[in-house]
């Protein structure tokens, strides 16, 4: 169950998708990857305050145990739950080819 | 692709499975778990330094862009790769009945 | 296996709207950097360039024809489709479609031969 | 808008020979914004080399292609039968995207 999309810590600042623009430089994809040049890479960033878009029944007991003892459990992360598939054109031994990879952006996001 | 396991902060400070016993009042299911009384909760937890287990395209993208702005993209967190299921005993309107939880217990965990 | 097939109404008659659609098969135009443009060639002359669709619905056009065209999509059932108004003799060429990531035409459609005649 | 001047338009090599087409550029772009096309009559085009030197897949490693700025080639480092084609460079630095006129290179 998807639980609260309330964040209680204000606006924005709790587990939610981000778009971070990236360079094949910053990647370290420049010596494989031919374009796109930059990518805007969506990604899951926030905060996973008690229930807060929580992924599954884990997700609930993670909160609970880390009320109880932070030190040892740590809060849920806030990761991508689907992603959106993404092409590169790319350099191979035979040559440039087309790879599509489904698992590169986020699509959107819970805590877990 | 699942990448290194080998942890380099030194044996068992990075991500793994660890168990947590925890009491139905800890998890907050004492009004409506019957058993077990005590639950071996398995959870995800350990550092993802650059690479460690990285569940796929995504955490590494995640690992290249933390280590160039590590105060705007968090590093990858330990999460769940898989479940084991778990039967709970639980009181319902009706009465006693058996329910299973595919989402309660980690089986493996990842970086992402 | 990515292939493409253009279909098209063959001979038309000048003033008509040419309606062209593209079928594609082996990708998906809901893909991040994904595309599909149109291009066509005049029997025995050279390549021109039409217009291009995205994934995220970006379309572009050639400035020498965009009053005339109209891109659009149906990522659904995988076809792109173009329409050129107003056609006259100088439109007849074969049509191509093409499979388009970011900035390559990459896979190309067999072609469909368009006679504008009176 | 970028106009590509393709030289020369016509030309016969002999299986063994070095063969260089050149692709002149109307206004400097990026040398990853320029690719080659091969076209053989009746059939439709296929890409053929990306980014001024990127040999698409399956392409043989005879073909070379170089350059920058203004100015870019494709080179057959020994002309065979198959070679026998139209080979078109086209920009995809700015709208509209344009290509040369072709150079149609026959088997002497």
């Known amino acids: 169950a998807r639980n609260g999309d309330h964040c209680p810590l204000g606006p924005g600042r709790c587990c939610r998708l981000h778009t971070v623009r990236a360079s094949l430089e910053d990647l370290g994809w420049a010596d494989w990857v031919l374009s796109p040049r930059e990518v805007q890479v969506t990604m899951c960033i926030g905060a996973c305050p008690s229930q807060f878009r929580a992924a599954n029944m884990h997700a609930q007991i993670k909160t609970s145990l880390h009320r109880l003892k932070p030190d040892t459990v740590p809060a849920p992360c806030c990761v991508p739950a689907s992603y959106n598939p993404m092409v590169l054109i790319q350099k191979t031994d035979t040559g440039v080819s087309l790879q599509t990879y489904d698992d590169l952006l986020a699509k959107d996001c819970h805590c877990i | 692709a699942r990448n290194g396991d080998h942890c380099p902060l030194g044996p068992g400070r990075c991500c793994r499975l660890h168990t947590v016993r925890a009491s139905l009042e800890d998890l907050g299911w004492a009004d409506w778990v019957l058993s077990p009384r005590e639950v071996q909760v398995t959870m995800c937890i350990g550092a993802c330094p650059s690479q460690f287990r990285a569940a796929n395209m995504h955490a590494q993208i995640k690992t290249s862009l933390h280590r160039l702005k590590p105060d705007t993209v968090p590093a990858p967190c330990c999460v769940p790769a898989s479940y084991n299921p778990m039967v709970l005993i639980q009181k319902t309107d009706t009465g006693v009945s058996l329910q299973t939880y595919d989402d309660l217990l980690a089986k493996d965990c990842h970086c992402i | 296996q990515v292939t493409l097939k253009e279909s098209g109404p063959g001979i038309l008659q000048p003033s008509q709207t040419l309606s062209l659609t593209c079928s594609f098969s082996?990708?998906?135009?809901?893909?991040?950097?994904?595309?599909v443009s149109w291009i066509r060639q005049p029997s025995g002359k050279g390549l021109e360039w039409l217009a291009l669709?995205?994934?995220?619905?970006?379309?572009r056009y050639n400035p020498s024809l965009k009053s005339r065209l109209t891109i659009s999509k149906d990522a659904s059932s995988n076809q792109v489709f173009l329409k050129i108004t107003s056609v006259d003799t100088a439109d007849t060429a074969t049509y191509y479609c093409?499979?388009?990531?970011?900035?390559?035409?990459?896979?190309w459609g067999q072609g469909t031969l368009v006679t504008v005649s009176a | 808008e970028i106009v590509l001047t393709q030289s020369p338009a016509l030309m016969a090599a002999s299986p063994g020979e070095k063969v260089t087409i050149t692709c002149s550029v109307s206004?400097?772009?990026?040398?990853?914004?320029l690719h080659w096309y091969q076209q053989k009559s009746e059939t439709s085009p296929k890409p053929w080399i990306y980014?001024?030197?990127n040999l698409a897949s399956g392409v043989p490693v005879r073909f070379s292609g170089s350059g920058s700025g203004t100015s870019y080639s494709l080179t057959i480092s020994s002309m065979e039968a198959e070679d026998a084609a139209t080979y078109y460079c086209?920009?995809?630095?700015?709208?509209?995207?344009?290509f040369g006129a072709g150079t149609k290179l026959e088997l002497k």
């Open positions: 093409i499979q388009s990531p970011w900035d390559w035409f990459a896979y």
């Open positions: 206004s400097s772009i990026s040398s990853s914004n």
């Open positions: 669709i995205y994934w995220d619905d970006d379309k």
């Open positions: 082996g990708f998906s135009l809901s893909t991040s950097g994904m595309g």
């Open positions: 086209q920009q995809w630095s700015s709208y509209p995207l344009t």
């Open positions: 980014g001024t030197s």
